[in-house]
Each structure stands twice: as C-alpha cells, then as structure tokens.
C-alpha cells in the first residue's frame, strides 16, 4: 500500500515537472524524455489494485519470443528447412485444431495430455498434439498414397513442463515424413540420415541416435510372458529407462502395472542391452527371440538398416537400444530417438544423455485408421525437437557472449546536417525500391553520433550519409561502421556498391 502511495506521489511530481518544462519552453528532447518517464511511472502504477487483480503473464507452459530469440529460431529453422528441401520434400500445413475424434485412440497413455476446446458450434475439437496424426488424416482424406513432405508448426500438450529445459505446453515441431510403398528400410535410413545431418549442422554438441523396432519389443514382451493387453503400458515403463534406473522401472511394472516379478526380470535381461549391428546379429541367434515371427522380421530389417546407414556414413552415430520404446501407440516398425551427450567426466565412462532432441519411426497402420476400407499407406518419419534445440543454442550463445543481429538492415540512411529529412526519405525509398534493406531514424534532425550509435547497437554494417556538400557533388558518403572508413560514392552507383559490400546478388530475381 505504501509502495503504491509512493508511486502515486512520483507520478504527481513527474506530472508537475513535465508541465513546468512545457511552460519554460524547454528543449523538445528534454520534454520528450520526461514525458516518457511519466508514462513509465503511470504504467508501473497500473490500474487501481482494488479494481483489478489481473496478473499480466503468458499462460503456463508458454512464452513470448523476443527479437533475439526469434533470430536464433529463424537460424535453426533455416538449417532444418534447407536439409528437408535438399532431400526433396514438399511442404504442407494443416489446421491447428482437429476434430476430437481424429486424435482419439492414437496416442495411448498420452491421450490425457490432449487439449480439448470448448464446444464450437456442435463440433468437438482438440488442439493437435503432434503433426503426424494430422498428416495421416490428410493422406486418408485426400486419398494420397505417396508423398515426401515436411511440416513445421506448433503443437499443444497439457504437460507439466520444465520450461527451463526447453519443454513447453505450446511448442514447435519440425516433421519430415515419407509415405508410400517402397523397398524395406531405404526411406527409414534416409530419415536417420536427415536427423544426423540436421543435428551435425546445428553444432549443438555430440549426439547419439538410439534405434529399436516395435516388432522386436512386441516379440520380446511375448516371449517374456507379457499379455497382449499389457504391451503398450509396459512399453511406456521401459521407455523411462533413459531417465531412471532399472530397479525403478521394474517396481513400476510390478507394483503399478501388475506384472509378475519373474516376467519383469526376463524383460530386464533384454532391455538393458545396447550396441551396434553385432547386437542385432547376436539377437538373431537368440533361441527364444529368433522363434518369434515379429521379432525376427524386426531384427532382419534392422540388419538391413545398418547396412544402409553404413553406406550413408552415419553408422557410428547409431546405437541399437532395446530399452527404446517410444510411448506413442501408432509406431509399427523401426523407432529412433536422438539424444545429446554430455562429455563424460572421465575417459572410459559411459556417455551421458541429456534429453531427446529428435525422434521418429515407422507407422504403417496410422493412415488405415482413417480409411473407411482400412487401406494402409506405409509411412516413416522424424520430428526435430526444436524447442530444446532453441534453448541449447540460446545458452551457448549467451555463454560465448555472442551478439546476435535481430534485423537484416544493410544500411542506415543518415544525415550530417539539419534540414535533410526530405533527402533522407528520397534516398531510403530509392534503396528500398532497389531491394536494399535500409532504415532511417524517425527524427527530423538526428545527431550524427546518435545515428552511428544506432548502427553499432543494431549491427548495421553501413551508413549512407547525406550532407549539403555531397548533395551538390551528386555523391553519398558511404561509411563502414566497423572500420569507420568513408568513401564518396556517386548516387547512381550507391545501390551496386552496397550490394557489393554486403554480398547481395546484383539483381533481385
């Protein structure tokens, strides 16, 4: 209460000060500054608290993106999109909300995290949970059997996110999927190649891609004695092995999910194994697992996959990990997940994962769920966890104290003397029309120092300075902000000179 009274007093004092300055006909700049102060004080005072208790914030699990964060985000997206396009993908978009029915029964235990919308004119709607189910719906609806597409958009999950670790309720996904009937494992291998290309290009640290197969998991559960009805729920327990110990996972399976302890132990013998193609070959010799048709198919495909991954030169980044059991119901074949590795404290220690940054797999049955005749369209895809990547890139840039440009302005149109606003407006317009990214300060007579300072702060590389003499001579002074070197450039050559200096193509084709 005392604080509000103090602020009210300051608002009153500042109001008097502004009025006094106006009466004294003080400089416009001083009045402008003091008015700005008054407005800031009033903003802090806000509405009377007795009238309003509203706290101004973004909803839980969401955030705004500052220009700096957007600059980081655009760089990350650029790397991802260029890779997707390099691999021949088309782009699509789908509505942010879907019919509730479309999303139901596709996510298993995660369905509780779907956001339902209030009644919208009779239709029961939900916000999309991922981009894969809407893609399958799109394929079925448009009777498509063959497409390679990418889709970058926001998805929504009613999670309890740890936002500091790059987890949110509203977040971007960057998906790449290949739909169609092709020879085994070729599209799957390309998806893994794309994942590795993107993570390498982003330079966010060393990573490992864990690979498994849903059929191997299901076969393993079957031979261990897990009933069909418990497959999915046991899967979600096994999937926690990257975060918690086997003991905790076993306790959950036995204590919460009603699995017999000896069944859990049998599962434990398998899911704690990981390795390369040699582990695939070892399991192909496993007397029990090799007798299971599903598991055998899965292992055969993985053997083939490793051959292709070797040809793509990424086999060193891939680990066959039997504990990988991605929680989504729709996977039917190969599944994979990329994790960043923390450098081990001691040589010879196991690399330590710091969370998934990309994931995906094969889902051959999802499109069929939407087709009245149950016609299947085999699909395989991947999703890049860009929110976590944004967080990592932001932290890295902060640690390096790197200055990030938040605009792409190439040149500031400045004046060295007063009364040159018209000339600045004419010149900036000429530059815009020629495709040059240009700005000017919104003041009639800005000080040259302020204009140069603005360039330094905004990272603008060039200043085009107009002066009385330059106007007479038909030249513009072009100044490099970093080197401070100035040259007179003929007005008709200015566009070309700016393009040359900023490495922009000379025509805007």
């Amino acid at each position: 209460m005392a604080e509000r009274a103090a602020l009210e007093e300051l608002v009153k004092l500042q109001g008097e000060r502004v009025r006094g300055l106006k009466q004294q006909k003080a400089s416009a700049e001083l009045i402008e500054e003091e008015v700005a102060k008054l407005l800031k004080l009033k903003a802090q005072l806000g509405p009377d608290e007795s009238k309003q208790k509203f706290v101004l914030k973004t909803p839980k699990g969401t955030r705004d993106y500052s220009p700096r964060q957007m600059a980081v985000r655009e760089k990350v997206f650029d790397v991802i999109i260029r890779c997707f396009k390099r691999h021949g993908a088309e782009v699509i978009d789908t509505p942010v909300f879907e019919l509730k029915e479309t999303l139901m029964g596709k996510y298993g235990e995660d369905s509780k995290l779907i956001y339902d919308l209030k009644d919208q004119g009779g239709e029961l709607l939900s916000l999309r949970y991922d981009l894969t189910v809407p893609f399958a719906r799109y394929l079925a609806m448009n009777k498509l059997t063959n497409i390679k597409r990418y889709h970058i958009a926001k998805v929504y999950r009613r999670d309890n996110p740890a936002m500091t670790r790059g987890r949110y309720r509203e977040f971007y996904q960057c998906d790449f999927d290949i739909a169609g009937n092709f020879d085994p494992m070729i599209p799957d291998a390309e998806c893994l190649k794309i994942m590795c290309e993107i993570l390498s290009s982003l330079q966010i640290g060393d990573f490992l891609v864990k690979v498994n197969d849903r059929r191997i998991l299901d076969g393993m559960f079957a031979i261990c004695g897990v009933s069909d009805s418990k497959f999915r729920t046991i899967c979600s327990s096994v999937d926690k092995l990257d975060k918690v110990s086997w003991e905790e996972v076993k306790n959950e399976m036995v204590g919460e999910k009603g699995l017999a302890p000896e069944v859990a132990d049998r599962i434990g013998d398998y899911v704690q194994q990981h390795g390369g193609v040699s582990l695939v070959e070892q399991l192909l010799q496993d007397p029990k697992l090799s007798q299971n048709k599903q598991a055998l198919e899965g292992l055969g495909d993985l053997k083939l996959l490793f051959e292709y991954l070797t040809l793509f030169g990424i086999d060193d980044k891939i680990s066959f990990d039997l504990s990988l059991a991605r929680g989504l119901d729709y996977y039917t074949g190969v599944i994979y997940e990329a994790v960043l590795l923390q450098t081990p404290a001691q040589a010879g220690e196991e690399p330590l994962g710091v969370g998934s940054v990309a994931a995906g797999g094969r889902y051959d049955g999802l499109v069929g769920m939407f087709d009245p005749k149950g016609r299947k369209v085999p699909c395989v895809g991947l999703s890049i966890g860009v929110e976590r990547i944004f967080s990592i890139v932001e932290q890295r840039l902060e640690a390096l104290e790197e200055k990030i440009r938040t605009t792409e302005t190439q040149v500031l149109v400045a004046s060295a003397q007063k009364k040159l606003l018209e000339e600045r407006l004419k010149l900036v317009s000429e530059l815009w029309d020629a495709g040059i990214k240009a700005e000017l300060l919104y003041k009639k007579n800005p000080k040259l120092l302020n204009q140069l300072q603005y360039c330094e702060e905004a990272g603008i590389p060039l200043v085009a300075i107009i002066g009385e003499q330059e106007l007479k001579d038909g030249v513009i002074k072009l100044r490099s902000v970093t080197s401070r070197e100035e040259v007179d450039v003929r007005r008709e050559d200015l566009v070309e000179e700016i393009k040359r200096r900023t490495g922009q193509p000379l025509c805007i084709c």
Partner: antibody
Framework: QVQLVESGGGLVKPGGSLRLSCAAS????????MTWIRQAPGKGLEWVSY????????DYADSVKGRFTISRDNAKNSLYLQMNSLRDEDTAVYFC?????????????WGQGTLVTVSS | DIQMTQSPSSVSASVGDRVTITCRAS??????LAWYQQKPGRAPKLLIF???SLQSGVPSRFSGSGSGTHFTLTISSLQPEDFATYYC?????????FGQGTKLEIK
C-alpha cells in the same frame, strides 16, 4: 538475486583510458535507467552520467563531458563507462546504480564499486 | 546546478537518541529529494525518496519531511547499526547533486 557488480577499475596514467562494466542480474535490466556515480577518496558523491533503458537518452556531468561515454547492452544485461583522457581528479570509487521505479533519478540498487586510480 | 547543503557536517549521539539532519537546496526542488546511508567501504543505501517515502525494507524509525528548499531526515531512536554518513540528493534536474554528507558518530 537482484544485484549489480562492477568491474574494470585499476591504476591508469593521466591521459589514459579505462572501460568500466556493470553486470546486472535478477531484474529486467532494459526497463531501468542506469547511472554511474563516483566518490573520490574521503569525499562526497558525484553523479557522473546516466542512460535510459532503451539507450535513447544519456547525459554527463560537465566535469566528464567529451571524455566519458556511457553505454549499455540490454541483451547482455550490462552497463559500461568508457573513460578517456583520464585526469588525476577522476580518481574515485565508481558505482553503478539503478534508478528507483525505473525512471526516477535516485539509486535504489547499487553495486559494490570499483576503484579507479589515475596517477603517474 | 542546484547546490545541496547539509547540516550539521557531523553529529555525536547515543543509542536511543532522536537525531535530525537538515538539507537545503539552492532553489526549489518540490519533493525531488532522497536520503542515503553509507558505511565505510560500502555503497550508499537508499533510505527515503520523494522527500518522505520510506524505501521498502528500511526500518520505520527513519522518516523524511520537507518540500521546496528545506528538508529533514529524522531517526527517532538511534540503533547501533545507524552510525554512518548520511547524504541527501536532489533528483529535480541534471546534474543530480548530493549534499556533502553528515557523519553520525557514537557519543
């Protein structure tokens, strides 16, 4: 926690230069006017310079005008004072401080100070 | 520039005493006045702003009054931690100026 930490002080010869930094944490730095205030050994306080939150406004005491430059980097939550053509009488502890209620020229949060000694 | 003059320049007092320090401005500054406390080797600490508003976290034994050109800082009952130098500062117009300080010592 909410704090200001200065650095960059030291011994410099008359005519020399020095750049002071002030790292802010625990508050929305870009909302606040910031200031440099100095205190000569055993003497009182002197307001040196200020800068507005958005970098739009700055001013300097007559004693330092043309020699000192105040600046800030809101992305790095940092305030700076570039001191050129230093004189003996610039010897002081330099404090950075935050304006009370963002815009009122009264320091409600101060750093611990950094000593600048100008001597031949 | 607005000159700020504090009196006395030093004062001796005992724990429990009531102490008043005065500050005069060379021209009217309305209520644009602050009081600070500074201990040796430390940064100043804001006590009062807008002539009479108590900064949050400052004990209520400190109070300020005045307007225009004449201001006072009062400590109603001195505590051992109050022995320090006190400065007034005008925030009416730049350059913002401080008084020369009042040293409060133990009697």
């Amino acid at each position: 926690q909410v704090q200001l930490v200065e650095s960059g002080g030291g011994l410099v010869k008359p005519g020399g230069s020095l750049r002071l930094s002030c790292a802010a944490s625990g508050f929305t730095f870009s909302d606040y006017y910031m200031t440099w205030i100095r205190q000569a050994p055993g003497k009182g306080l002197e307001w040196v310079s200020y800068i507005s939150g958005s970098n739009a406004y700055t001013d300097y005491a007559d004693s330092v005008k043309g020699r000192f430059t105040i600046s800030r980097d809101n992305a790095k939550n940092s305030l700076y004072l570039q001191m050129n053509s230093l004189r003996d009488e610039d010897t002081a502890v330099y404090f950075c401080a935050r304006y009370v209620y963002q815009v009122v020229a009264i320091g409600d949060l101060w750093g611990q100070g950094t000593l600048v000694t100008v001597s031949s | 520039d607005i000159q700020m003059t504090q009196s006395p320049s030093s004062v001796s007092a005992s724990v429990g005493d009531r102490v008043t320090i005065t500050c005069r401005a060379s021209q009217g500054i309305s209520s644009w006045l602050a009081w600070y406390q500074q201990k040796p080797g430390r940064a100043p600490k804001l006590l009062i702003f807008a002539a009479s508003s108590l900064q949050s976290g400052v004990p209520s034994r400190f109070s300020g009054s005045g307007s225009g050109t004449h201001f006072t800082l009062t400590i109603s009952s001195l505590q051992p931690e109050d022995f320090a130098t006190y400065y007034c500062q005008q925030a009416k117009s730049f350059p913002y100026t401080f008084g020369q300080g009042t040293k409060l010592e133990i009697k």
